[in-house]
Amino acid sequence: AFNLTWISTDFKTILEWQPKPTNYTYTVQISTKSGDWKSKCFYTTDTECDLTDEIVKDVKQTYLARVFSYPAGNVESTGSAGEPLYENSPEFTPYLETNLGQPTIQSFEQVGTKVNVTVEDERTLVRRNNTFLSLRDVFGKDLIYTLYYWKSSSSGKKTAKTNTNEFLIDVDKGENYCFSVQAVIPSRTVNRKSTDSPVECMGQEKGEFRE
């Protein structure tokens, strides 16, 4: 196997590799630095393995996976060193590296010249006490949202930031505004920002307006 790659968004984590097998199968093992290797996706002909269940046990740990190749019908086959042939993945630390999924604007509410914009707190596959944690639960204040907003009638964008899931911004009375948000983890060195949310504009069904 080669080109082992971690594909991870909001902690949903898949290991992908090449090539498509012809006459052999794959088994994946994953471990933290403890070296307690756990086998997954036994003798599969797929070239991906969902490792979410393993990495969500502790998203701050660093993981390594390895893909073993076995000739079909002979799961005991070994390389010249007397062991199954395998290749190691790059290291992967979910908390530092999982991609931030595209956020969604849950609602916005205008009261006079103020608008409260709320970002949906997406549920992740990380569990604590048998309940799934939200993105905010996992990242806490490490996660911020950036709001981009502009008058429907112009293209000049303004920005606001929050380390909660809510923004309170000033707007001009009588003007319609459009909004888009982006999730950001400023402390990261990679995968710092999500893609922008879909644009939501005042006058559409997500909004509430009160004088």
């Epitope: 471990s31 933290t32 630095k33 403890s34 070296g35 307690d36 290797w37 060193a81 290749e87 190691n88």
Partner: antibody, heavy 118, light 106 residues
């Protein structure tokens, strides 16, 4: 500061036994595989054994298989190497090392000397 | 077992020299190689892992390269503190060390 401190070395007769200990501090002991590496006088490094963080997986060099047993007590942050049926060629400085994934050694102890001689 | 062969076994050099040590594996080990430095009477110290990743706190004059069966450790400008013995170690299949390269003062 991450520290490893070996003890238990000494002079032992051929066929005898010895138990080495390695006290770890400065890191979460159970989060890491650990290993033993030895160095005979004037020679190079030789890997001896590795154990996973839970103690569930162990690996041995062919030269010590069946004679040496690696173990750990995570509640005491201590790694052990039980050495039985010792031979003259087991004479060496034995180093304990922290071994991420059981692959390479990123922190080493100062070593303890084992001499097998009659 | 995978055999690791280092060359040269001894290398004479002067402060400021660029020094290169080679390590060959008896079969492909991809990039699963580490380099260590050891001074007399002391424990080894990790310099490089995964063939080219510099361990935290190690001076940038040390670098590693290579993949497959041939690897090099380079010291860009030899310092007085660098006179020591250097070992490579593969971790593709269990663990084996090279025989060591002693870097001595010319």
């Amino acid at each position: 500061e991450v520290q490893l401190l070996e003890s238990g070395g000494g002079l032992v007769q051929p066929g005898g036994s010895l138990r080495l200990s390695c006290a770890a501090s400065g890191f979460t002991f159970s989060d890491y595989a650990m290993g033993w590496v030895r160095q005979a006088p004037g020679k190079g490094l030789e890997w001896v054994s590795t154990i996973s963080g839970s103690g569930g997986l162990t690996y041995y060099a062919d030269s010590v298989k069946g004679r040496f047993t690696i173990s750990r007590d995570n509640s005491k942050n201590t790694l052990y190497l039980q050495m039985n049926s010792l031979r003259a060629e087991d004479t060496a400085v034995y180093y304990c090392a922290k071994a991420p994934y059981g692959y390479y050694m990123d922190v080493w102890g100062k070593g303890t000397t084992v001499t097998v001689s009659s | 077992d995978i055999q690791m062969t280092q060359s040269p076994s001894t290398l004479s050099a002067s402060v400021g020299d660029r020094v290169t040590i080679t390590c060959r594996a008896s079969q492909s080990i991809s990039s699963w190689l580490a380099w260590y430095q050891q001074k007399p009477g002391k424990a080894p110290k990790l310099l490089i892992y995964k063939a080219s990743s510099l361990e935290s706190g190690v001076p940038s004059r040390f670098s590693g390269s290579g993949s497959g069966t041939e690897f090099t450790l380079t010291i860009s400008s030899l310092q007085p503190d660098d006179f020591a013995t250097y070992y490579c170690q593969q971790y593709k299949s269990y663990i084996t060390f090279g025989g060591g390269t002693k870097v001595e003062i010319k």
